[in-house]
């Protein structure tokens, strides 16, 4: 019986530890996509509607803030699209990029952790164009560090929650 009690306590401890594991999945807020034709920071994301969820991390001022030291898996998926009903592209040669950036407040510094993308030729003869970028990686993050997303050509972003999103989840503690 003692072994059973110990086992259930162990399960509970494991489960509460799992429940405390930080994670976030943030989806683009389509009502507030910034304008610009060069690299801009995306600061408006949902954290609590649709597929978006956050736990033991903080979303503030457009940045995902780490609350616990650890090794995290970071990911971002960005979709760009253009349909002729919205008008014409002013240029057919495009650089479609995403940058995942880490900012440290304690030692003021900023680093690009991941970038992805391509130069594209989107011909005016086509009715519809689409391009998707997915980046992901494993990083050591400290409490207080902030993760943000920058993209080129935000006016071409696909605003759907299954198209443009980013997130993080803690994989293990720092030894």
């Amino acid at each position: 019986e003692k072994a059973m009690v110990d086992g259930s306590w162990l399960d509970l401890a494991k489960r509460s530890k799992l429940e405390a594991q930080p994670f976030a999945h943030l989806t683009i807020n389509a009502t507030d996509i910034p304008s610009g034709s060069h690299k801009v920071s995306l600061s408006s994301w949902y954290h609590d509607r649709g597929w978006a969820k956050i736990s033991n991390m903080t979303f503030s001022n457009g940045k995902l803030i780490v609350n616990q030291d650890g090794f995290y898996y970071l990911y971002a998926n960005i979709c760009f699209r253009h349909h002729e009903t919205s008008g014409d592209l002013a240029t057919e040669y495009l650089q479609l990029m995403v940058y995942v950036t880490k900012t440290s407040i304690k030692i003021p510094s900023s680093h690009t952790l991941m970038k992805g993308g391509s130069t594209k030729y989107w011909s005016g003869n086509s009715e519809f164009h689409f391009y998707s970028i997915n980046v992901g990686g494993f990083f050591k993050l400290r409490s207080g560090e902030e993760i943000s997303i920058e993209v080129s050509n935000p006016s071409l972003l696909d605003p759907d929650q299954d198209a443009t999103y980013f997130g993080a989840f803690k994989v293990r503690d720092i030894d």
């Epitope: 610009g36 034709s37 009903t85 919205s86 008008g87 014409d88 592209l89 002013a90 935000p154």
Partner: antibody
Framework: QVQLVQSGAEVRKPGASVKVSCKAS????????IHWVRQAPGQRLEWMGW????????KFSQKFQGRITVTRDTAASTAYMELRSLRSEDTAVYYC???????????????????WGQGTLVTVSS | EIVMTQSPSSLSASVGDRVTITCRAS??????LNWYQLKPGKAPRLLIY???SLQSGVPSRFSGSGSGAEFTLTISSLQPEDIATYYC?????FGQGTKVEIK
């Protein structure tokens, strides 16, 4: 304030060419596209083409492809539309119009014509 | 190629009347629809963009509605200065125009 001032009326014989100018003022010419639209007597407005004043990129209606050239002089903040091999059906009022989309804000030419020139009457007659 | 069709082609109304002009697209164009006012010898004027947004400086008696393939321009109280031809437009395609006159 934003203004587009076009050149004066022109009369041409069939087979000739005409070049209409459109001088912009009151805004940063290079940050916007200029469209050319015409209206023949008793007809609807007809889009002809656009030029991105910043990079010189152009797009034309299939109908005018091969007969139309649109250029710009950024130093003079002026766009030009030349139509060749004129025929009587080309008799119309030709307008230039600014696209509302600022190329610094994004790269989509949205076809919102927020400012127009006063129009240039081109008459093609033998 | 998208075709825009306006109705009626002309109308006559009294000052103060509510006037409605309809524009249909041959396929769905979301809300990418603009309305212009054209007076003889004058530069055309953008009234409504994006189906329902009032262009700066345009009197509030003008309003636009609709999405998909059917759109409406409404003048809530017709004024003498509203005598003109009105055109709907989606990117490269214009409607054939509606001539508005005073009774």
């Amino acid at each position: 304030q934003v203004q587009l001032v076009q050149s004066g009326a022109e009369v041409r014989k069939p087979g000739a060419s005409v070049k209409v100018s459109c001088k912009a003022s009151g805004y940063d010419f290079s940050n916007y596209a200029i469209h050319w639209v015409r209206q023949a007597p008793g007809q609807r407005l007809e889009w002809m083409g656009w030029i991105n004043a910043g990079n010189g990129n152009t797009k034309f209606s299939q109908k005018f492809q091969g007969r139309i050239t649109v250029t710009r002089d950024t130093a003079a903040s002026t766009a030009y539309m030349e139509l060749r091999s004129l025929r009587s059906e080309d008799t119309a009022v030709y307008y230039c119009a600014r696209d509302e989309s600022n190329m610094v804000r994004g790269i989509i030419i949205a076809y919102y014509f927020d400012y127009w020139g006063q129009g240039t009457l081109v008459t093609v007659s033998s | 190629e998208i075709v825009m069709t306006q109705s009626p082609s002309s109308l006559s109304a009294s000052v103060g009347d509510r006037v409605t002009i309809t524009c249909r697209a041959s396929q769905s164009i979301s809300r990418y629809l603009n309305w212009y006012q054209l007076k003889p010898g004058k530069a055309p004027r953008l009234l409504i963009y994006g189906a329902s947004s009032l262009q700066s400086g345009v009197p509030s008696r003008f309003s636009g509605s609709g999405s998909g393939a059917e759109f409406t321009l409404t003048i809530s109280s017709l004024q003498p200065e509203d005598i003109a031809t009105y055109y709907c437009q989606h990117t490269r395609a214009f409607g054939q125009g509606t001539k508005v006159e005073i009774k």
